[in-house]
Interface confidence: low
Amino acid sequence: HEGVHRKPSLLAHPGRLVKSEETVILQCWSDVRFEHFLLHREGKFKDTLHLIGEHHDGVSKANFSIGPMMQDLAGTYRCYGSVTHSPYQLSAPSDPLDIVITGLYEKPSLSAQPGPTVLAGESVTLSCSSRSSYDMYHLSREGEAHECRFSAGPKVNGTFQADFPLGPATHGGTYRCFGSFRDSPYEWSNSSDPLLVSVTGNPSNSWPSPTEPSSKTGNPRHLH
């Protein structure tokens, strides 16, 4: 829907991956003076929340406290601003933000081939595996906002595995992976133990964009 005002911004603090029972703050903000903010969730359980806007230094914002985190609070969130209350005149929606609950299932294992310490320019692949029959694996890197997502391969030696080819190593970092099931895209496993990948040589600040690998599926947006 077009909206009478431009879209506000929606951020998650401390991040969009939220452990079960923990709380996330979804901050909706705009430089338009909105008196009201509405936060709408799509997912298994739809909902809409309303807060009065706060105004500081030309910025309007509302902090929505979501938690303690449970499955029915996970989903795709969008926020709207409104300058009036009766009737509401909604802005265009913010960009969608997927909030994922983690810590629900057994943690997968994460390993690096040929190993966690590689020479600059050398190819490195991260493998995420589990005895649990996860349909999807998600790889996150500390400090990055998005995750890579790969389908799990067929069962081999009692485990389901996905390989994340990071390509020629240019920059180290701490990686974690999670497993999830196809019918519950917002519900993820416990995090794997963190894996520190070290690159010897000249590092640069890049790692494959989550939209680059052709084998990867897109981030979930809607269940319905």
Epitope: H40, K46, D47, H50, P68, H85, Y88
Partner: antibody
Framework: EVQLVQSGAEVKKPGSSVKVSCKAS????????ISWVRQAPGQGLELMGG????????NYAQKFQGRVTITADESTSTAYMELSSLRSEDTAVYYC???????????????WGQGTLVTVSS | EIVLTQSPGTLSLSPGQRATLSCRAS???????LAWYQQKPGQAPRLLIY???GRATGIPDRFSGSGSGTDFTLTISRLEPEDFAVYYC?????????FGGGTKVDIK
């Protein structure tokens, strides 16, 4: 001030369905979150679900999922709650309620309808 | 879901006395989003208190709410004849919204 007026009492047979209406006045109906709460005789209050007309999405309590359908008609400022596969334990007073604005939660229920008694008996 | 347990189930008091009603949550109530309602026979519930301690419009100041986290209290400082009713607490900070089982305040 928001006012909610509900349809009259109903007597239904087990296995049938009932549809209760809730007409709102005194505000912007499309922005109300209309919740439905039921109360069995001598018992407490139980949330069934709710709807926000402007978003058109209903939210149902797990216990009622699959049996309850909540809808809204913006042209008549009326919300509806339909409960199917009725059994004797569904005998209760059914209330619609609202905070007078958006929100299934993060708002208390300020305004209530007068209640509709649904009796399920063979 | 958050389970709310109210106590006592029944409180027998005389007009003029002080009533203290308790509501305990199975887990912390987000932002103290807890409400209290009064319900008289044959009537719909009426909102008394929101946000654990805020009085709703038109509610006399003999009604007060307090508490945070998992323990909440509704106090009626001096019972009037019209205060004899059933009182429910409700949390509205987490989905699904839930109600306590109620406390009946009756005349001794």
């Amino acid at each position: 001030e928001v006012q909610l007026v509900q349809s009259g009492a109903e007597v239904k047979k087990p296995g049938s369905s009932v549809k209760v209406s809730c007409k709102a006045s005194g505000g912007t109906f499309s922005s109300y979150a209309i919740s439905w709460v039921r109360q069995a005789p001598g018992q407490g209050l139980e949330l069934m679900g709710g709807i926000i007309p402007i978003f058109g999405t209903a939210n149902y309590a797990q216990k009622f999922q699959g049996r309850v359908t909540i809808t809204a008609d913006e042209s008549t400022s009326t919300a509806y709650m339909e409960l199917s596969s009725l059994r004797s334990e569904d005998t209760a007073v059914y209330y619609c309620a609202t905070s007078g604005g958006y929100s299934y939660f993060l708002s208390p229920l300020d305004y209530w309808g007068q209640g509709t008694l649904v009796t399920v008996s063979s | 879901e958050i389970v709310l347990t109210q106590s006592p189930g029944t409180l027998s008091l005389s007009p003029g006395q002080r009533a203290t009603l308790s509501c305990r949550a199975s887990q912390s109530v987000s932002s103290n989003y807890l409400a209290w309602y009064q319900q008289k026979p044959g009537q719909a519930p009426r909102l008394l208190i929101y946000g654990a301690s805020g009085r709703a419009t038109g509610i006399p100041d003999r009604f007060s709410g307090s508490g945070s986290g998992t323990d909440f209290t509704l106090t009626i400082s001096r019972l009037e004849p019209e205060d004899f009713a059933v009182y429910y607490c409700q949390q509205y900070g987490s989905s699904p919204l839930t109600f306590g089982g109620g406390t009946k305040v009756d005349i001794k």
